[in-house]
């Protein structure tokens, strides 16, 4: 299957940090933690230090206005979560600065947020078919759903 | 233009110490991750070690970890690579190397040093 | 860690030649792939990121392809100044790795 969607060929412009500093809990309120240097994994924690705080930035892009591309860094890091595949983990890469534009290939840096309520989804838009998602003991990954969860409550104003 | 020169290599003995450094110009040296990757003479390349752009996070190769240290000092441009407990097989030429301007590490590398030879006397 | 096969090891071309270089990974890396050309006495010179993007200044006779696990650098004219040793980089994990490097030298 080809690597990247037919939206890779946008460009998403950068408007400004829209978050600082979130948690971000699975339906089965498990929080994301980081696994390791490159992988991140939810777990059940009782101390939210160990959660890893997310900001999230906003972008526009020329053609679609209906949906909210953003891009995910843990905060106070230069580290910004990044798409791979179905049922392969989410990475996270180091960048010196938040990119101002993105295309092409790029767009594995971007997801689509989504709101219905209290639930929150970030569908890839490399991947439009695929969210990022929690699975039991193991890393936080890209999955179209079942029996991962795609679906996330995000806990504010925990710096 | 982005330069990355090395100094440090010569000749030393198996079992000693010898620190390498980068010194860099050209690009805001504290926003970019840093690599050592190094070549044996006839050989391929063989990534060694890099340190993040604050120098909090350190990756090392395995054929390296608990010998080799990466550091940088970003108020004077410079990245070190201290190498203790030297062995024959650590006998290469050693390029300080920078990432492209997005993703620095893991990254491609797009800014490389001229290298910097490690010999052994015997 | 993952590991990095190139084939050939080495390969005997012509100027004008189509030369086709493969690279392997030990496992998944979706586009995270660089090619790099290097000549005897220099640095590594990138020509290729993310599997299919150039590099600036490249020469568009440089081309790249794959995802997953298998890659393709390849020169659709084999000119003078490409003789060298290519060697692909995996960059989907922090550990970077290598492969083996393939030779492109004078039939």
């Known amino acids: 299957s080809a690597p990247f969607s037919f939206l890779s060929n946008m460009t998403y412009h950068f408007i400004r940090i829209i978050k600082h500093e979130f948690i971000l809990n699975d339906t089965l309120n498990q929080t994301i933690i980081r696994a390791n240097d490159q992988y991140l994994t939810a777990a059940a924690i009782h101390n939210l230090d160990e959660a890893v705080k997310f900001d999230m930035g906003a972008y526009t892009s020329s053609k679609d206005d209906t949906k909210v591309p953003v891009i995910l860094r843990i905060s106070k890091t230069q580290l910004y979560v990044s798409a791979q595949d179905e049922d392969q983990p989410v990475l996270l890469k180091e960048m010196p600065e938040i990119p101002k534009t993105i295309t092409g290939s790029e767009t594995n840096f971007l997801f689509f947020w989504e709101t219905h309520g209290t639930k929150n989804y970030f569908i890839s838009v490399a991947h439009p078919n695929l969210f990022i998602a929690t699975k039991h003991d193991n890393w936080v990954c890209l999955a179209k759903g079942l029996p991962s969860i795609t679906d996330f409550q995000i806990l504010e104003n925990q710096a | 233009q982005v330069q990355l020169v090395e100094s440090g290599g010569g000749v030393v003995q198996p079992g000693r110490s010898l620190r390498l450094s980068c010194t860099a110009s050209?690009?805001?040296?504290?926003?970019?991750?840093v690599h050592w990757v190094r070549q044996a003479p006839g050989k391929g390349l063989e990534w060694v070690a890099a340190v993040s752009y604050d120098g909090s996070n350190k990756y090392y190769a395995e054929s390296v970890k608990g010998r080799f240290t990466i550091s940088r000092d970003n108020s004077k441009n410079i990245l070190f690579l201290q190498m203790d407990s030297l062995r024959l097989e650590d006998t290469a030429v050693y390029y300080c190397a920078r990432g492209r301007p997005k993703v620095v590490i893991p990254a491609p590398l797009a800014h490389w040093g001229q290298g910097t030879l490690v010999t052994f006397s015997s | 860690d993952i590991q990095m096969t190139q084939s050939p090891s080495s390969v005997s071309a012509s100027v004008g030649d189509r030369v086709t270089i493969t690279c392997r990974a030990s496992q998944g890396i979706s586009s995270w792939l660089a090619w790099y050309q290097q000549k005897p006495g220099k640095a590594p010179k990138l020509l290729i990121y993310e599997a299919s993007n150039l590099e600036t200044g490249v020469p568009s006779r440089f081309s790249g392809s794959g995802s997953g696990s298998d890659f393709t650098l390849t020169i659709s004219s084999l000119q003078p100044e490409d003789f060298a040793t290519y060697y692909c980089q995996q960059t989907s994990s922090f550990l970077l790795s290598f492969g083996g490097g393939t030779k492109v030298e004078h039939k």
């Open positions: 050209g690009f805001t040296f504290s926003m970019f991750g």
